[in-house]
Interface confidence: low
């Protein structure tokens, strides 16, 4: 028999199987071009001294076989003797150490049996109800094909799983999405409807993250507020990456999960812009505002779960930036001036409500005053910090007001709203004798003294009703008694205590009358 | 690759409604900031309207504030334009555009094709 | 709102030439600024944003400059493919707004 040839004869070997587990295997046979025919198969086991032989039987009975070699590929034309239009049996008979082993057969009709393509290019995932759907594009002339999948996880080996008939320009695969893990997915494609044809090659892999990006596990510190006002936040621990399956590593698309920073400015509600996002790797400097910082972690499939950090304001307070001037029209507040056209947030928040949201007014841009200050004033009518209590003021300036990134803190101090000088006058004056020429003065503390940094100072004054004359005593704020020294007994005096503060002076208490009685000796 | 495919326009007579929407593909839709800009023709560009990534920040031009909504549905991966009491001078082409973030405050990297909106009687 | 004032509204240059077009804000918008290139019958592209960064495809010979209320569009050497419509784009403040075009044509 010629080598281009099915040969109708007896093969040269004794045609028993031995039914061992090696031999040949995944036979498949398909039309290569007009006229040409090509056969395919895997060898299982040690090749030395193997000869193949690819057999066909036809539907009339009649059986032949080429010899191959060691080779598990034959290419053969319509004229080799093989009918191409007719059904046919074929199956391998591999001969080696005096035994022949068998693969298992294929019934086909060459003629239609088209090598099929798997998917190419683009596929398309999606998510669908809980599922994963995969789509892509038809090869050309390749309509009506039988789908099947292949899916593993990076702990798992492959699954196989079927896509059903197609029938379309576009073909689709509904498959299993994982929540928690990766996976990853590779198709092939045969004719449908004819069960004897070879599957295609396996796709390129399709990598599929879970359906739950993983939480983002990091964590947050925050530096100290610099001398401009702002402080860098800074990523102690990165997120933990995600395991991947073996074709999924290196720079397979599709797995990816970004994680981005969102971060919620608490204070100064009255700006324009409370949130912004930024990539992870994008560590912000920030204000010595209080914030929340969410981590995001996202994937093809969208937004997973957050973890949020909660950064407390920082609350160190300048006592000297901030000059206050309360005049009959309303109050004036300076602070030294930031660059040209910058926009100030003034926010105040009464102590000891915290938890509340506070009371904030935004400037126009400004430029600073010849004195380099900024300013910001107020009518009394409006009723900013009007009630006589301690407020905490918090000034924040930025250049570019939208840009939540750009805010830094100008200063935060405190300050005591409303009439400060009449509610600060201190109450309940005592004067008890402490010697023979002097006396014990005591007060309640100033209700300025809640507010700190607010109370300069207190002043005792002494009046000699007698000669007028006057003598006054500064007392440290952290003090409420003082003792008057230098009296003369018999004469009558008035005592008064009076709470300033760095701009404002106090209003006296009421006059307390007292005198130190002549000692008669006896 | 990311596409905007713009959709809903036509003629339409002075005084009625229009409804664009705009499907997004390619790219994870509620991620970014979307906003509808629109071109008169023969003029320049306008821009209309935006939304954040989860529809808590709309803005609007003040050509179009009180008769135009935009909204989202991130289900669908589509942006919506509801146009109301539409005028003469509504007529454009109306792009759908992407701002590289989850909020607005940026340009537009990519954009829809355009649909045209012809307000006439 | 904050208008955008682009200069010229219309330019005629050969290819290789070096293009300059301005724009003008009518009040500080910091980098907050983008370039779009728009050919007829097609949506406009991002070129440039915050004023000066480079949009990624976007080839070499554009770049953009400028802070505050004066920027700048450069195209160092002409390109067939350039000539085109160009847009400056403000992005500080709401509304948004464009300026009105410089129509860049062949000598």
């Known amino acids: 028999c010629g080598t281009s040839e099915c040969c109708f004869q007896d093969p040269p070997y004794s045609d028993a199987d031995s039914g061992s587990a090696s031999g040949p295997r995944d036979l498949s046979c398909y039309r290569i071009s007009s006229a040409g025919y090509e056969c395919s198969w895997q060898y299982e086991g040690p090749t030395a001294g193997v000869s193949h032989f690819l057999r066909c039987c036809l539907s009339s009975g009649r059986c032949c076989y080429f010899a191959t070699g060691s080779a598990t590929r034959l290419q053969f034309s319509d004229q080799a003797g093989v009918s191409v239009l007719h059904t046919v049996t074929l199956w391998v008979e591999s001969w080696a150490r005096n035994r022949t082993e068998k693969s298992p057969e294929v019934t086909l009709q060459l003629y239609k049996s088209v090598k099929y393509k798997p998917p190419l290019g683009d596929i398309k995932v999606s998510k669908l109800a809980g599922q994963l759907r995969m789509e892509w594009e038809t090869p050309d002339n390749q309509v009506g094909a039988e789908v099947q999948f292949r899916h593993r996880t990076p702990s798992s080996s492959w699954k196989l799983g079927d896509c059903g008939p197609q029938d379309d320009d576009t073909e689709s695969c509904l498959c299993p999405l994982e929540m928690n893990v990766a996976q990853e997915f590779q198709l092939r494609r045969r004719r449908l409807g004819s069960q004897g044809s070879s599957w295609s090659k396996w796709s390129s892999p399709v990598c599929v993250p879970p359906e739950n990006p993983p939480q983002p596990q990091v964590r947050f510190s925050v530096e100290q507020l610099g001398r401009d006002g702002r402080r860098r936040l800074t990523l102690k621990e990165q997120p933990t990456q995600l395991e991947l399956p073996e074709g999924c590593q290196g720079p397979a698309p599709g797995v990816e999960v970004t994680y981005q920073l969102q971060l919620h400015m608490l204070s100064c509600p009255c700006k324009a812009k409370a949130t912004r996002t930024l990539p992870l790797e994008k560590m912000p400097y920030l204000s010595g505002a209080a914030y929340n910082v969410a981590v995001i972690s996202s994937n093809r499939f969208g937004p997973g779960p957050n973890q949020t950090w909660h950064i407390p304001a920082d609350t160190h307070t300048e006592p000297v930036a901030l000059n206050i001037s309360v005049g009959t029209n309303g109050t004036t507040m300076y602070w030294p001036a930031r660059a040209q056209s910058t926009t100030y947030c003034i926010e105040w928040q009464p102590v000891g409500q915290e938890g509340s949201l506070a009371t904030c007014n935004l400037t126009a841009p400004q430029d600073p005053d010849p004195a380099g200050m900024a300013t910001y004033s107020w009518s009394r009518e409006s009723g900013a910090m009007g009630q006589e209590k301690c407020y905490h003021i918090t000034i924040f300036a930025s250049a570019h007001p939208k840009k939540l990134t750009l805010w830094s803190t100008v200063l935060s101090t405190y300050h005591f709203g409303g009439n400060a000088s009449a509610a600060g006058t201190p109450h309940h004056v005592s004067v008890k004798n402490h010697s023979l020429d002097s006396v014990s003065v005591d007060w309640a503390p100033s209700l300025l003294s809640t507010c700190p940094g607010v109370l300069k100072e207190y002043v005792v004054r002494c009046r000699d009703e007698d000669s007028n004359q006057v003598s006054e005593h500064p007392v440290q704020p952290t003090e409420t008694q003082v003792t008057l020294s230098d009296l003369r007994a018999g004469v009558a005096y008035t005592v008064q205590v009076r709470a300033d503060t760095a701009w404002l002076r106090g209003a006296w208490s009421q006059p307390q009358r007292f005198s130190i009685k002549v000692q008669v000796s006896d | 690759q990311v596409q905007l495919v713009e959709s809903g326009g036509g003629v339409v007579q002075p005084g009625r409604s229009l409804r664009l929407s705009c499907a997004a593909s390619g790219f994870t839709f509620t991620s970014y900031g979307m906003s509808w800009v629109r071109q008169a023709p023969g003029k320049g560009l306008e821009w209309v309207a935006g939304i954040s990534y989860d529809a808590s920040d709309t803005e609007y031009a003040d050509s179009v504030k009180g008769r135009f909504t935009i909204s989202r549905d991130n289900s669908k991966n589509t942006l919506y334009l509801q146009m109301n009491s539409l005028r003469a001078e509504d007529t454009a082409v109306y792009y759908c555009?992407?701002?590289?973030?989850?909020?607005?405050?940026?340009?537009?990297?990519?954009w829809g094709r355009g649909t045209l909106v012809t307000v006439s009687s | 709102a904050i208008q955008m004032t682009q200069s010229p509204s219309s330019l005629s240059a050969s290819v290789g030439d070096r293009v300059t077009i301005t724009c003008r804000a009518s009040?500080?918008?910091?980098?907050?600024l983008a370039w779009y290139q728009q050919k007829p019958g097609k949506a406009p592209k991002l070129l440039i944003y915050?004023?000066?960064s480079l949009q990624s495809g976007v080839p070499s010979r554009f770049s953009g400059s400028g802070s505050g209320t004066d920027f700048t569009l450069t195209i160092s050497s002409l390109q067939p493919e350039d000539f085109a419509t160009y847009y400056c784009?403000?992005?500080?403040?709401?509304?948004?707004?464009f300026g009105q075009g410089t129509k860049v044509e062949i000598k």
């Open positions: 915050d004023a000066s």
């Open positions: 784009q403000q992005y500080w403040w709401y509304p948004f707004t």
């Open positions: 009040q500080g918008i910091s980098s907050d």
């Open positions: 555009a992407r701002s590289p973030d989850y909020i607005i405050d940026y340009g537009f990297d990519y």
